[in-house]
């Protein structure tokens, strides 16, 4: 065979990934690999992930002679050990006036009265703890409730008898019940006065309210 067909182990170099070829014999060679590679021709990227240092559930992503940590959303930093301040990242993390409190690996919301839930989006059902009298209907409000009374009942909790039931107001007067004590209040038409709107008044006087 001619000299042009002679095998020269390092020409061209069989070493890849930046490896350096060294001829060790007539037909043999050795590759000196760059850090991070191995194999007879430096063809293999060494896996740097075994027993990695990614913490808090971080996932190791192998590189060349190094690795990166892919962190869960609540962690950051080289090894996922730095807490993400969700309160800074999400100014509206807490709703309905709730205050955001950053914590290691997460955050919490301190809700204002009447709201609950992780992000203060749930209106607390005040009716669950309300003491509306049986037979009345509870209406939930924000940090409060109101009782809708059946006929014949009055008061904030519908615990009083409605004094207007007996029609104590005369002469077309309007009867209202005082929600605190259950007593009636007569709003007299023009020309009448008195607790029951039974007394005449001088002309010129307009409506009169009388409590009883």
């Amino acid at each position: 065979a001619g000299s042009d067909s002679l095998y020269v182990p390092c020409a061209p170099s069989p070493c890849v990934n930046g490896g350096t070829c060294r001829q060790t014999g007539d037909f043999t060679f050795e590759c000196n690999c760059l850090p991070g590679f191995e194999g007879s021709t430096c063809e293999r990227n060494i896996d740097d992930c075994p027993n990695h240092r990614c913490q808090n559930g971080g996932v190791c992503v192998d590189g060349v002679n190094t690795y990166n940590c892919r962190c869960p959303p609540q962690w950051t930093g080289q090894f996922c050990t730095e807490d993400v301040d969700e309160c800074l990242l999400q100014p509206n993390a807490c709703q309905n006036g709730g205050t955001c409190a950053n914590r290691n690996g997460g955050y919490g919301c301190v809700c204002v009265n009447g709201w609950s839930g992780d992000d203060c989006s749930e209106n607390i059902d005040d009716c669950a703890f309300a003491s509306c009298t049986p037979g009345s209907t509870c209406i939930d409000r924000v940090a409060s409730f109101s009782c809708m009374c059946p006929e014949g009942k009055a008061g904030l909790l519908c615990h009083l008898d409605d004094a207007c039931i007996s029609n104590p107001c005369h002469k077309g007067a309007l009867c209202d019940t005082n929600p605190l004590n259950g007593q009636y209040i007569c709003t007299c038409p023009q020309g009448y006065k008195g607790a029951d709107c039974t007394e005449d008044v001088d002309e010129g006087n307009s409506h009169h309210h009388h409590h009883h």
């Epitope: 075994p50 240092r53 913490q55 808090n56 930093g77 090894f79 050990t81 730095e82």
Partner: antibody, heavy 117, light 112 residues
Framework: EVQLVQSGAEVKKPGESLKISCKGS????????IHWVRQMPGKGPEWTGY????????KFNEKFKGQATISVDKSSTTAYLQWSSLKASDTAMYYC??????????WGQGTLVTVSS | DVVMTQSPDSLAVSLGERATINCRSS???????????LHWFQQKPGQPPKLLIY???NRFSGVPDRFSGSGSGTDFTLTISSLQAEDVAVYYC?????????FGGGTKVEIK
């Protein structure tokens, strides 16, 4: 509050065995690796190795490989550094540490190991 | 391993004056993720090292603002803008970009 509490000082003779401890509290122990750092008298700190409490996997500085072992007891949230045969050159202050904002953010108070005949 | 060289070995500064400590690495500390993992620690006698600055220039919680860090690549600096009596200690730089993490030899800061 993150706390790492180490066992007390030890005086040993060459060839003796030793196991020192580091108890972690105030955080989720299994979420963080525990490092051991050696500081020889008058010298700077040297990272020795770490253990992953969740798996028990370890990683060592090549310089310290085969000289000591690191283990963990998850139930008591405690990591250990152990020698089977101490040498005079093992005399040093040994710290355990945990990562945080940077490397080795939280440290134990240290365990002084003196090896002398 | 990456060699961390600190200078000077010791430093005497008057109270209220500026103290500057340098740290040089044997190779670039820029990680493949783009960050530079160079940290500074303070160690007082009989105590463990205490993290002051992480990732070149971020002060750790509770660290006074007279401590600041700067630099890039292979050259880094810790500055104490106005030295206080409680700052007397040995200061170490640490790199965690390359395995294994390596500390500098330390710089002792004293009062002149």
């Amino acid at each position: 509050e993150v706390q790492l509490v180490q066992s007390g000082a030890e005086v040993k003779k060459p060839g003796e065995s030793l196991k020192i401890s580091c108890k972690g509290s105030g955080y989720t122990f299994s979420n963080y690796v525990i490092h051991w750092v050696r500081q020889m008298p008058g010298k700077g700190p040297e990272w020795t190795g770490y253990i992953i409490p969740g798996s028990g996997g370890t990683k060592f500085n090549e310089k310290f490989k085969g000289q000591a072992t690191i283990s963990v007891d998850k139930s008591s949230t405690t990591a250990y550094l152990q020698w089977s045969s101490l040498k005079a050159s093992d005399t040093a202050m040994y710290y355990c540490a945990r990562d945080g904002a940077g490397s080795f953010t939280y440290w134990g108070q240290g365990t002084l190991v003196t090896v002398s005949s | 391993d990456v060699v961390m060289t600190q200078s000077p070995d010791s430093l005497a500064v008057s109270l209220g004056e500026r103290a500057t400590i340098n740290c040089r690495s044997s190779q670039s500390l820029v990680h493949s993720d783009g960050n530079t993992y160079l940290h500074w620690f303070q160690q007082k006698p009989g105590q463990p090292p205490k993290l002051l600055i992480y990732r070149i220039s971020n002060r750790f919680s509770g660290v006074p603002d007279r401590f600041s860090g700067s630099g890039s690549g292979t050259d880094f600096t810790l500055t104490i803008s106005s030295l206080q009596a409680e700052d007397v200690a040995v200061y170490y730089c640490l790199q965690s970009t390359h395995f294994p993490d390596t500390f500098g030899g330390g710089t002792k800061v004293e009062i002149k």
